[in-house]
Amino acid sequence: AFGISGVQKYTRALHDSSITGISPITEYLASLSTYNDQSITFALEDESYEIYVEDLKKDEKKDKVLLSYYESQHPSNESGDGVDGKMLMVTLSPTKDFWLHANNKEHSVELHKCEKPLPDQAFFVLHNMHSNCVSFECKTDPGVFIGVKDNHLALIKVDSSENLCTENILFKLSET
């Protein structure tokens, strides 16, 4: 719709966004599902967590994720439009001390155990590009989003604003 040559132009200098304070502005537990209503589940296997995208059986309990929302300042000299903007960034933690991380080298989404302050790889810029769905863009790699590939979460490069609404990067949050 906007004829932008690549999402880098669309989301500039996310690397340099500073997170305002170290405490989240809000936190809550929600289940995470895909645009097509498959559930994101987490399983402990061989002392490490695996992330799956799957259809749950009827009445099967959905895994919950703690979403922590942070406000990030985006100074006008970086935003490209002369406006000091703010963004929402999130971290996602399905179990104590473990957070979703972007592994940009492997184009994968992994669960890592770590202490606060969390590394930048654990922060995702929140988009709601589609009615009542959200997308998660890597803070460390603008234009790269958490997406679904082969029943797993992966990092997916979105190369134009038209593709921001592609179903495999859209997720639903539900507190039930």
């Epitope: 002369g82 988009h127 709601n128 590009m129 038209e162 609404c165």
Partner: antibody, heavy 121, light 107 residues
Amino acid sequence: QVQLQESGPGLVKPSETLSLTCTVSGFSLSKYGVHWIRQPPGKGLEWIGVLRAGGTISYNSALMSRVTISVDTSKNQFSLKLSSVTAADTAVYYCARDHYYYSSFGGFASWGQGTLVTVSS
Amino acid sequence: DIQMTQSPSSVSASVGDRVTITCLASQTIGAWLAWYQQKPGKSPKLLIYAATRLADGVPSRFSGSGSGTDFTLTISSLQPEDFATYYCQQLNSTPYTFGQGTKVEIK
């Protein structure tokens, strides 16, 4: 400086189409969602729809069959069309911009001054 | 659609009074609630976003609290310029519905 300015005819005949334009400056439509909201005289606010930063559009289901939102990024404008209007569509129409980049969760930080549209023959 | 119910619909108060307005959502909306102030003939002005965050340039006598379904806007010491109508709005899901408004009038 962030600015939004609504423009369009102040009087529309019943059954015709109401057309308004919002011209924006001081920010990019590729980064912020922009909304149409209306307020009938002496009443509360009603959300009409949003043009999101990625170009997708969502509408209030109560108006969906009659409303169209479109954008002309080259002119920094987005538009509202409301068809088959009746006296109940008489209202001040506002455009507004999201507080946050890329999402509407933070409410609407900047508003136009509003334009009164009267539906009458 | 999520219904937003504001109370009271109007309140009469004096300068210096503490004023509390509540907003109830018909289903949980997390922290995604905004409060606006509107004066006659003017556009709404964002006061509070994300339930508790003060918008730029808003005096600290305004504060917001709550999450889930129950939210409150408090004006700790009412000033002459605060007489206006106040609206809550949920931003958890479309359509982004507003409360019906609370008019704060001079006693």
